[in-house]
């Protein structure tokens, strides 16, 4: 949602967290601001304090309940407001009618581990965190491998078009240090975006056996 020079973007992690970023040109630096969440069909409402992340950008997380509790559904609409203190009052700086399942961004995958490693290949698994059971198998993944002498931005993306929480990396170089990351995205939602990348998993391929071709 945009108001003048203000931008207010929020994502639902599909369970019990709405993360918001509000940016505004020329906003008052000393002002206390909050995000208020008012669901249309729930008894609860929630607030979080916006904290600066850059010169003109603030962020906060609305914690709606226990991490794995299903606090919102596809039919919910949540009115989200940015409120800033002026004098003793609050002023509405930005507002949006938020449809949680149209604005999804899951948590980064966790528990990455090497299942099996060889000279030229490595099998890696991971788990998704705090993802709604509503998705069933309707998830996709992207993975990337960092090779020596390259940057993450240069790493080619591997796409897994189904809910597959493992990958077999092929054509690796023996006795070489690599790093691996994965991210997840539900297929649902007009404004849904990729999760953050997972923490990198470092692994090393096995050395080639002496006297054998590589």
């Amino acid at each position: 949602a945009v108001n003048g020079t203000s931008q207010f973007t929020c994502f639902y992690n599909s369970r019990a967290n709405i993360s918001c970023v509000w940016s505004q040109d020329g906003a008052l630096q000393d002002t206390s601001c909050q995000v208020h969440a008012w669901p249309d069909r729930r008894r609860w409402n929630q607030t979080c304090e916006l904290l600066p992340v850059s010169q003109a950008s603030w962020a906060c997380n609305l914690i709606l309940g226990a991490p794995d509790s299903q606090k919102l559904t596809t039919v919910d609409i949540v009115t989200l407001r940015v409120l800033c203190r002026e004098g003793v009052r609050w002023r509405v700086m930005a507002i949006q009618d938020f449809k949680p399942f149209e604005n999804l961004r899951l948590m980064a995958p966790i528990s990455l581990q090497v299942v099996h490693v060889e000279t030229h290949r490595c099998n890696i698994s991971w788990e998704i965190s705090q993802a709604s059971h509503y998705f069933e198998r309707h998830l996709e993944f992207e993975a990337r491998t960092l090779s020596p002498g390259h940057t993450w931005e240069e790493a080619p993306l591997l796409t897994l078009k189904q809910k597959q929480e493992w990958i077999c990396l092929e054509t690796l170089t023996p006795d070489t240090q690599y790093e691996f990351q994965v991210r997840v995205k539900p297929l649902q939602g007009e404004f849904t975006t990729w999760s953050p990348w997972s923490q990198p998993l470092a692994f090393r391929t096995k050395p080639a056996a002496l006297g054998k071709d590589t």
Partner: antibody, heavy 121, light 112 residues
Framework: EVQLVQSGAEVKKPGASVKVSCKAS????????ISWVRQATGQGLEWMGE????????YYNEMFKGRVTMTRDTSISTAYMELSSLRSEDTAVYYC??????????????WGQGTTVTVSS | DVVMTQSPLSLPVTLGQPASISCRSS???????????LEWFQQRPGQSPRLLIY???NRFSGVPDRFSGSGSGTDFTLKISRVEAEDVGVYYC?????????FGGGTKVEIK
């Protein structure tokens, strides 16, 4: 029906203090802000500041800082405005007015009837 | 502080005729949230001020539709389409965009 009833007229000597009360009814006192506005005889309106009865937080117009104190007593739904070190220029009608805690639309919707304060030696 | 300047100071009008009051702010009063908190108050003789218009052009509840507000940036207008006897009094513009909030000096509407 929303009502703000203010205390009666006061006559004060220069250098003295005056305390005006504003009793609210017809709404939840702690859900709204009380603003104070004054009007010197034959003059325009001047916003003095306000108090949020919910947590007693105040904000004063710089012009009155150091001389004005706004308080409230939630048990009797009453807001107070005290002005000290009075001078003849403070002779005015003092109004309290209700305002929404979240300034979405307007600053003040309902007003008290006003309290005349005369500063004279 | 934002200075609000009203004109004219006095406005003699004929019953049933239109009336127009101007209000000019010393700086732009568009708030950083993109709203303009320009309000108009009416003060009848011997009475407290009463809210007529908020956010430039929105009529407060119970305000007759002969009252209308317009304008943007620094220039605003209150119009009364057909003045009635009960409209006599002083009209004040008010800005709530920049603290301290400030009023105009007032325009006295009287019947010719």
């Amino acid at each position: 029906e929303v009502q703000l009833v203010q205390s009666g007229a006061e006559v004060k000597k220069p250098g003295a203090s005056v305390k005006v009360s504003c009793k609210a009814s017809g709404y939840t006192f702690t859900d709204y802000v009380i603003s104070w506005v004054r009007q010197a005889t034959g003059q325009g309106l001047e916003w003095m500041g306000e108090i949020y009865p919910g947590d007693a937080q105040t904000y004063y117009n710089e012009m009155f800082k150091g001389r004005v104190t706004m308080t409230r007593d939630t048990s009797i739904s009453t807001a107070y405005m005290e002005l000290s070190s009075l001078r003849s220029e403070d002779t005015a009608v003092y109004y309290c007015a209700r305002g929404s805690y979240t300034y979405d639309n307007y600053a003040m919707d309902f007003w008290g009837q006003g309290t005349t304060v005369t500063v004279s030696s | 502080d934002v200075v609000m300047t009203q004109s004219p100071l006095s406005l003699p009008v004929t019953l049933g005729q239109p009336a127009s009051i101007s209000c000019r702010s010393s700086q732009n009063i568009v708030h950083s949230n993109a709203n303009t908190y320009l309000e108009w108050f009416q003060q009848r003789p011997g009475q407290s001020p009463r809210l007529l218009i908020y956010k430039v052009s929105n009529r407060f509840s119970g305000v007759p539709d002969r009252f209308s507000g317009s304008g943007s940036g620094t220039d605003f207008t209150l119009k009364i389409s057909r003045v009635e006897a009960e409209d006599v009094g002083v009209y004040y513009c008010f800005q709530g965009s920049h603290i301290p909030w400030t009023f105009g000096g007032g325009t006295k509407v009287e019947i010719k």
